[in-house]
């Protein structure tokens, strides 16, 4: 921002009323009113160019310094060409000297040259030649000098003529301030510019109404340079929640809009399924039946729990069930749907029911499922099972109602036994099997059926209560097809896969384990 000038002295604006002191009195500098650029103006002039050595002084009135540390002196003046004065060229000069003196009191008419310190020799960029002057055109020069630091209550300026033909049209003395400033939603007070050119005064800003320094952000600061310019902004303020930046201020969010945190972003329109917000809202309340999860941003629409899963099917495969379902028709407006599967078993004889989580096995953990199918195994035969699939999302926990679908299935067969070849010889095969422990109590006997591969006319059956059998009197180096089936009081259970096991050839030795 441009520096602000505070004027301490303005000769041109005073209309000849300042009454500056001339020394020697009545000689040298002279105040007169003249017309320049068709305007009557007062000016001090001197033109003793033919009179040899000159030492004519013009001293300003005493100027109160106030808060100024460095002053700037702007001079507007015109100098006539020494060649305009025939015979005057030898003693004629085209410069004058600028001086200042500090003091704590006004010395009045007591003028003492020795108290003055020279600031500079003032030389014109352009001189006024005779032809210009006679046509009433003078070349106006503008020079600026600065002095500081000043420490006394006031000061004088003085102009020393050493034999020039010069007119002083304007003397303006001012100091500079960095003007009051609003930047980055921070207010910086008007600040006096320092006196030392390299130094920058650090000035703390204050956040405007309804603005705050963001968490972890830097407090707003600016630097006031010697020329009254603000430099190097640091930090900023942001409009607090419920307010947005409008030009250099924070304005409350309009009704129907909200802003949930201090940020640079504008207020946002209330999202779907929210009630109209009042002015200055930090969030928008949800419509009845809609909710916002703790981790949901305020900008997200309010949502509700999903409807129940769609099309739940339970397909029994022996002592296993595959559950399949489709996602809810209404997701509640969310994408974070998960499923939970629970299981209940009922005994047909007694009609008694109870949870079965401990006795069954799921293909993946039954809670927090993201897929839409799961396999449940280790089911007991001749048992009724009811499976419940519940759909949940991020706001389901905010309501007591549940969204679920159930499917029931009756297990009529045991699960097929898992068969292993334990050993073999040229004439025998040792076979073992297993079924899930919950089903074992319901098995009366196991039936092992075997025959030569390729012989479809005859087969052999062996029954046993145990979990293994050795099949003897077999042909060497021959492949046999073997199947094991559980027998229960209610009938046959599911048969195992048909396995191909081969006896050893005669060259093979004894009873080798496989």
């Amino acid at each position: 921002a441009q520096g602000k000038e505070v004027v301490l002295l303005d000769f041109a604006a005073a209309g000849g009323e300042l009454g500056w002191l001339t020394h020697p009195y009545g000689k040298g500098w002279d105040l007169m009113q003249n017309i320049m650029n068709d305007m009557p103006i007062y000016m001090y002039s001197v033109c003793n160019v033919m009179s040899g050595d000159q030492d004519n002084w013009l001293r300003t009135n005493w100027v109160y310094r106030g808060e100024a540390e460095r002053i700037f002196i702007e001079l507007k003046f015109t100098v006539r060409d020494c060649n305009s004065f025939p015979g005057g060229a030898s003693s004629c000069k085209e410069t004058f000297n600028l001086y200042y003196a500090e003091s704590d009191l006004d010395y009045g008419t007591n003028f003492q040259k020795r108290l003055f310190t020279k600031i500079d020799t003032i030389a014109p960029d352009e001189i006024t030649v005779s032809s210009d002057f006679e046509a009433r055109h003078v070349k106006l020069n503008v020079e600026e000098r600065s002095v500081g630091p000043l420490t006394r209550k006031g000061f004088y300026l003085a102009f020393q003529d050493i034999g020039a033909c010069v007119a002083l049209l304007s003397v303006r003395v001012y100091y500079k301030k960095c003007p009051e400033l609003l930047q980055g939603l921070a207010h910086f007070p008007e600040t006096i510019a320092g006196s030392d050119a390299p130094s920058l005064a650090t000035v703390a800003g204050t956040c405007v109404d309804h603005a705050v320094v963001p968490p972890g952000g830097e407090e707003p600061r600016m630097h006031c340079a010697v020329d009254g310019e603000w430099l190097v902004p640091i930090g900023q303020c942001l409009c607090q929640a419920g307010y947005e930046k409008v030009e250099d201020a924070c304005q409350a969010c309009s009704p129907g809009f909200f802003k949930f945190e201090a940020s640079e972003s504008p207020c946002l329109e209330c999202p779907e399924h929210t009630l109209p917000s009042p002015e200055g809202a930090t969030s928008c309340e949800c419509e009845e039946g809609f909710f916002r999860a703790p981790q949901d941003p305020a900008s997200m629409p309010c949502t509700r729990p999903p409807s129940a899963p769609h099309y739940l099917t339970a397909v029994g495969m022996g002592a296993k069930v595959e559950l399949r379902w489709t996602p809810p028709q209404d997701s509640g407006g969310r994408e974070d749907i998960v499923y939970s599967v629970t299981c209940e078993q009922c005994w047909p004889e007694s009609g008694e029911c109870g949870p079965c989580e401990a006795s069954v096995r799921y293909s993946e953990p039954p809670h927090g499922l993201t897929r839409t199918s799961v396999t449940v195994s280790d089911l007991e035969p001749h048992m009724n099972y009811t499976f419940t699939v519940e759909a949940r999302n991020g706001v389901s926990g905010l309501v007591t109602s549940r969204s679920f679908r159930t499917a029931s299935v009756s297990i009529n067969q045991t699960e097929p036994p898992k068969v292993r070849l334990e050993g073999r010889s040229t004439t025998s095969l040792s076979v073992s099997w297993s079924i899930p422990p919950p089903q074992q109590s319901r098995v009366w006997k196991y039936e092992v059926t075997y025959r030569k591969k390729g012989d479809s006319n005859s087969y052999n059956v062996r029954r046993t209560e145990g979990f293994s059998v050795t099949l003897d009197d077999l042909a060497p180096d021959t492949t046999y097809l073997v199947q094991v089936q559980a027998l229960t009081q209610e009938g046959q259970g599911a048969g195992s896969k048909v396995h191909e096991f081969q006896t050893l050839s005669p060259e093979g030795s004894g009873n080798l384990a496989v």
Partner: antibody, heavy 125, light 107 residues
Framework: EVQLLESGGGLVQPGGSLRLSCAAS????????MYWVRQAPGKGLEWVSS????????YYADSVKGRFTISRDNSKNTLYLQMNSLRAEDTAVYYC???????????WGLGSDYWGQGTLVTVSS | DIQMTQSPSSVSASVGDRVTITCRAS??????LAWYQQKPGKAPKLLIY???SLQSGVPSRFSGSGSGTDFTLTISSLQPEDFATYYC?????????FGGGTKVEIK
């Protein structure tokens, strides 16, 4: 003390010539514009001619243009008006006048601060 | 040429009276106007320059005002030595021109 002293006036027949002089003292003559102003008997003031400090530009009233010539000799501090082809209507008291202004502004042309006592020119047959 | 018109051409007044003389230029002359006083048989005397600046040595009862085309010379309290003829003169451009004069007479 500033003084301007005109001379050279008198009676002259129509068509005749006169040369007026104005001797200046008490100021730096070479700095200032100078003027000739006349006043016919019982009439008002009429500007006749001007010359700049350097002797450069000269200006004349339409009524005398081509007949009168203004000049100056800064070394002698003297202003002149050469009047030719005089007419009866040129009868007047002729004043030389100095441009006002001190120091720097000498010759700026604000007005005339010093006047001579005047010399009478009578054109009559 | 710029014509200067003075009014009134004469005015009768008594000692102590306030007298106002006006001068009108045929075109704008900014503040390039001078006022002179002339007594019979004497050379004119400069009173005011630059429309409103009092010439050194002139009594402060004389004042000038105006700019552009309309100008005024005011004598705030007429003194016996002020009975004379007053002329305005434009110094804006050549040819320099005077007003016709205003004669201030004793009533």
């Amino acid at each position: 003390e500033v003084q301007l002293l005109e001379s050279g006036g008198g009676l002259v027949q129509p068509g005749g010539s006169l040369r007026l002089s104005c001797a200046a003292s008490g100021f730096t003559f070479s700095y200032y514009r100078m003027y000739w102003v006349r006043q016919a008997p019982g009439k008002g003031l009429e500007w006749v001619s001007s010359i700049y400090s350097s002797g450069g530009p000269t200006y004349y009233a339409d009524s005398v243009k081509g007949r009168f010539t203004i000049s100056r000799d800064n070394s002698k501090n003297t202003l002149y008006l050469q009047m030719n082809s005089l007419r009866a209507e040129d009868t007047a008291v002729y004043y030389c006048a100095k441009d006002m202004g001190t120091g720097f502004w000498s010759g700026w042309g604000l007005g005339s601060d010093y006047w001579g006592q005047g010399t009478l020119v009578t054109v009559s047959s | 040429d710029i014509q200067m018109t003075q009014s009134p051409s004469s005015v009768s007044a008594s000692v102590g009276d306030r007298v106002t003389i006006t001068c009108r230029a045929s075109q704008g002359i900014s503040s390039w106007l001078a006022w002179y006083q002339q007594k019979p048989g004497k050379a004119p005397k400069l009173l005011i320059y630059a429309a409103s600046s009092l010439q050194s040595g002139v009594p402060s009862r004389f004042s000038g005002s105006g700019s552009g085309t309309d100008f005024t010379l005011t004598i705030s309290s007429l003194q016996p030595e002020d009975f004379a003829t007053y002329y305005c003169q434009q110094a804006n451009s050549f040819p320099l021109t005077f007003g016709g004069g205003t004669k201030v007479e004793i009533k």
